[in-house]
Interface confidence: medium
């Protein structure tokens, strides 16, 4: 029997053992987070699968993910949302120490999908482990991109109080309008619930004492946020290593001076 023709995409294929990984992550998450113990992980997987299986992987919509979003509904306390852009590892290190703050990947749906790739094929129940659409080379409406756009929108919409965002000061565009933060989250913060957005610009170089809050892209972010009737503030984190150390050991005498 000849193997059936399969669409060849430019991106890497579905992560191996994808169904098992999602299910295992779900079980682990619900065990660790008592407020999510009511979640039925088999239903979560069914809803996840239903969003992309048998569908043309360049024609996925946010609507496809709504059953999953509904099952994964979670709220973050006001002042405890941490967004990030191009600096995921430090953001996650921070919330691992500062346990009362949350990135999207600390929430159930973000935790399930973090670092995974997935896609299906039109009219078959198979998962494509060979290749999946690349956002640039193939299409933007692919299962992974649409998932992150959907859950990022929801995460931003439900944020309240003072919202923080960690930005990478080593990049040419510290604030990038084309990033998920710049294209989705910024525009879905709700002015009637969000008091302020505070950007933490993380410096890369040890001797870098410039005020990156004066960077033109940060001024652009300030303009976008202010026009949405949300206050904007910015802080330089000159020493990310010291920053994390001081979060871990706040009473350390060296933490009384600036970071």
């Amino acid at each position: 029997v000849l193997p059936r023709w399969r669409q060849q995409w430019s991106g890497s294929g579905t992560t191996s053992r994808f169904p098992e990984t999602v299910l295992a992550r779900c079980v682990k998450y619900t065990e660790v987070h008592p407020e999510m113990r009511h979640v039925d992980c088999q239903s979560v997987w069914d809803a996840f699968k239903g969003a992309f299986i048998s569908k043309y992987p360049c024609n996925i919509t946010e609507e496809d993910y709504q059953p999953l979003v509904k099952l994964g509904t979670q709220t973050v306390p006001c002042n405890k949302t941490l967004l990030w852009s191009r600096i995921k590892d430090l953001a996650h290190q921070f919330t691992q120490v500062q346990r009362d703050m949350f990135t999207l990947e600390d929430m159930l749906l973000g935790y399930l999908a973090d670092d995974l790739t997935w896609c299906g094929e039109f009219n078959t129940f198979e998962i494509n482990y060979q290749s999946c659409p690349d956002w640039r080379k193939d299409c933007s409406n692919n299962p992974v991109s649409v998932f992150w756009k959907t859950v990022s929108r929801r995460f931003a919409e439900t944020a309240c109080g003072v919202v923080h965002v960690m930005l990478n000061g080593s990049r040419s565009k510290i604030f990038d309008k084309n990033s998920t933060f710049g294209s989705v989250e910024v525009h879905n913060l709700q002015p009637e619930k969000v008091q302020a957005l505070e950007a933490w610009v993380i410096h890369g170089g040890r001797e870098d004492s410039r005020d990156l809050c004066q960077d033109p892209t940060i001024k652009e972010l300030e303009s976008i946020i202010s026009k949405r009737n949300i206050r904007f503030f910015c802080k330089n984190i000159y020493r990310p290593d010291k920053f994390l150390q001081c979060v871990k050991n706040p009473e350390d005498s060296s933490c009384l001076s600036g970071i």
Partner: antibody
Framework: EVQLLESGGGLVQPGGSLRLSCAAS????????MNWVRQAPGKGLEWVST????????YYADSVKGQFTISRDNSKNTLYLQMNSLRAEDTAVYYC?????????????WGQGTTVTVSS | QSVPTQPPSASGTPGQRVTISCSGS????????VYWYQQVPGTAPKLLIY???QRPSGVPDRFSGSKSGTSASLAISGLQSEDEADYYC???????????FGGGTKLTVL
């Protein structure tokens, strides 16, 4: 001129209720988070409650939770504080205050205050 | 401790420099901005310092704020008789999810 004008204070018996109002003028009321702060006779300032610009986010001091309700009507540029089950320790001057746009928790404009006396 | 602590009273003579302290904890002063309010008896409070050390327009530069760790200070230089008032520090407390005021310091100009 930016102004806040409180009203609705007065003498009330223990267990009674009062509704305070704060009329705002001279600024875009619907864009600002608003607060109630009180001061008992001869005592210091005590934060009571905060409400977000759209009214969907609300904070209360533990001392008034379940007893006071903050609300706002942006179409009328008015902030409210509904006070129920009043006790002698609620006797105070009640101030409404607007948040400073330039930071998070500073209050840059205050009303002149309205006096609430709880006594039998 | 939950509520920031201030000395109940302070005093100085005209022209002198006076400092008022405000001591808190990591959940309030250290991790959040500090504000200072001036209240002349019988009047509403007035914002004097915001975001640790910023002065609103109209506040004389004789008033300055500073913060180190879990403590904050308000310094008044060139003391004048009209500075006689109650001074309150305030901040947000992340553990209580509440705004908190210090107990207040009564400043007397001798």
């Amino acid at each position: 001129e930016v102004q806040l004008l409180e009203s609705g204070g007065g003498l009330v018996q223990p267990g009674g209720s009062l509704r305070l109002s704060c009329a705002a003028s001279g600024f875009d009321f619907s864009s600002y988070w608003m607060n109630w702060v009180r001061q008992a006779p001869g005592k210091g300032l005590e934060w009571v409650s905060t409400i977000s610009s759209g009214g969907s986010i609300i904070y209360y001091a533990d001392s008034v939770k379940g007893q006071f309700t903050i609300s706002r009507d942006n179409s009328k540029n008015t902030l409210y504080l509904q006070m129920n089950s009043l006790r002698a320790e609620d006797t105070a001057v009640y101030y409404c205050a607007k948040d400073n746009w330039n930071d998070y928790y500073g209050m840059d404009v205050w009303g002149q205050g309205t006096t609430v006396t709880v006594s039998s | 401790q939950s509520v920031p602590t201030q000395p109940p009273s302070a005093s100085g003579t005209p022209g002198q420099r006076v400092t008022i302290s405000c001591s808190g904890s990591s959940s309030n002063i250290r991790d959040n901005y500090v504000y200072w309010y001036q209240q002349v008896p019988g009047t509403a409070p007035k914002l004097l310092i915001y975001k640790d050390d910023q002065r609103p327009s109209g506040v004389p530069d004789r008033f300055s704020g500073s913060k180190s760790g879990t403590s904050a200070s308000l310094a008044i230089s060139g003391l004048q008789s009209e500075d006689e008032a109650d001074y309150y520090c305030a901040t947000w407390d992340g553990s209580l999810n509440a705004r908190v005021f210090g107990g207040g310091t009564k400043l007397t100009v001798l």
